[in-house]
């Protein structure tokens, strides 16, 4: 059900930190904001759900990482990559990116100055 979380590599690296956190609440939070009218997303019903559940857990998870621009950017890139295939059109991709870049601010963190969210070989 869950990944094996072992001590591999440099434990202070952003990659290690991003791997340790649960980014699903962040993904759900953003999808809810851009797809709130749709009935289902994944196996979870987001139609009647307050976004604050996901946001609280999302912010808690992002807070677990060192609050550096690079680590925050890597987390946002990972979220983008995870959700890329679910975004149906260009407009949705742009909406998702907009919400994603607002995420650190919603959690009262510093937003990364430069963060390239073009992932998955340019598809997103």
């Amino acid at each position: 059900m869950r990944r094996e979380r072992g001590r591999q590599g440099d434990s202070s690296s952003c990659e290690r930190q991003v791997d340790r956190v649960n980014l699903k609440p962040c993904e759900q939070h953003i999808m809810q904001r851009i797809m709130g009218e749709q009935e289902q997303y994944d196996s979870y019903d987001i139609r009647s759900t307050r976004s604050s559940d996901q946001q609280q857990r999302c912010c808690d998870e992002l807070n677990e990482m060192e609050n550096t621009q690079r680590c925050m950017c890597e987390a946002l890139q990972q979220i983008m990559e995870n959700q890329c295939d679910r975004l149906q059109d260009r407009q949705m991709v742009q909406q998702f990116k907009r919400e994603l870049m607002n995420l650190p601010q919603q959690c009262n963190f510093r937003a990364p100055q430069r963060c390239d969210l073009d992932v998955s070989g340019g598809r997103c």
């Epitope: 059900m1 869950r2 990944r3 979380r5 072992g6 001590r7 340790r20 649960n22 699903k24 609440p25 993904e27 759900q28 994944d42 196996s43 979870y44 019903d45 987001i46 009647s48 759900t49 307050r50 604050s52 559940d53 996901q54 609280q56 857990r57 808690d60 807070n63 677990e64």
Partner: antibody
Framework: EVQLVESGGGLVKPGGSLRLSCAAS????????MNWVRQAPGKGLEWVSS????????YYADSVKGRFTISRDNAKNSLHLQMNSLRDADTAVYYC????????????????WGNGTTVIVSS | EIVLTQSPGTLSLSPGERATLSCRAS???????LVWYQQKPGQAPRLLMY???TRATGIPDRFSGSGSGTDFTLTISRLEPEDFAVYYC?????????FGQGTKLEIK
């Protein structure tokens, strides 16, 4: 074997203090959020407090806010609950519980529990 | 604070029967953050279901979970003697992470 063992319970007078501990073994303690949950005699479960992996985020139930302090020592694989200004209503079995999440879908759950330590607040 | 209300308080059934336990939230809860636990006398709680409908490791398929928003259900299709216990729902999306008051499933 994955295990949580609570200690530090006992009899204390109202207004007194007690420090509970939870020793973790069989897993990488620093990779998990941890919780304290209590159960008063003959009553249901009551979530008390949670602490994230790095201790950066901490939450408390309203009933214990300002009186209880949760902490952890990742180097020693231990979780603590400092309980001050104890009241009769704090009498309960206190469980330490590990919180994990499903990596593919995201939900959180408490999958490993200790057997509990009993706290009795009485004059 | 999200209040979870479980019903019925006590459910008296016989082995082989179907049990339906309800958990109602005072505010909408994401399925992602709804968990069910089982507790037997003198024992620590045991994880049963998470994400409202996913069975935990080792939980038999006679247990199933469903629901969304404010109404969630735990169903045991055919009761076995070892299923008689107290069942709790919990939401863990928004602090404080509240539990329902429990439903006691007893042998009729």
């Amino acid at each position: 074997e994955v295990q949580l063992v609570e200690s530090g319970g006992g009899l204390v007078k109202p207004g007194g203090s007690l420090r509970l501990s939870c020793a973790a073994s069989g897993f990488i303690f620093s990779d998990y959020n941890m919780n304290w949950v209590r159960q008063a005699p003959g009553k249901g479960l009551e979530w008390v407090s949670s602490i994230t992996r790095s201790s950066r985020t901490i939450y408390y139930a309203d009933s214990v806010k300002g009186r209880f302090t949760i902490s952890r020592d990742n180097a020693k694989n231990s979780l603590h609950l400092q309980m001050n200004s104890l009241r009769d209503a704090d009498t309960a079995v206190y469980y330490c519980a590990r919180e994990d999440f499903d990596v593919s879908t995201g939900p959180y759950y408490m999958d490993v529990w200790g057997n509990g330590t009993t706290v009795i607040v009485s004059s | 604070e999200i209040v979870l209300t479980q019903s019925p308080g006590t459910l008296s059934l016989s082995p082989g029967e179907r049990a339906t336990l309800s958990c109602r939230a005072s505010q909408s809860v994401s399925n992602m953050f709804l968990v069910w636990y089982q507790q037997k006398p003198g024992q620590a709680p045991r994880l049963l279901m998470y994400g409202a409908s996913t069975r935990a490791t080792g939980i038999p398929d006679r247990f199933s979970g469903s629901g969304s928003g404010t109404d969630f259900t735990l169903t045991i299709s055919r009761l076995e003697p070892e299923d008689f216990a107290v069942y709790y729902c919990q939401q863990n999306g928004n602090s404080p992470y509240t539990f329902g008051q429990g439903t006691k499933l007893e042998i009729k």
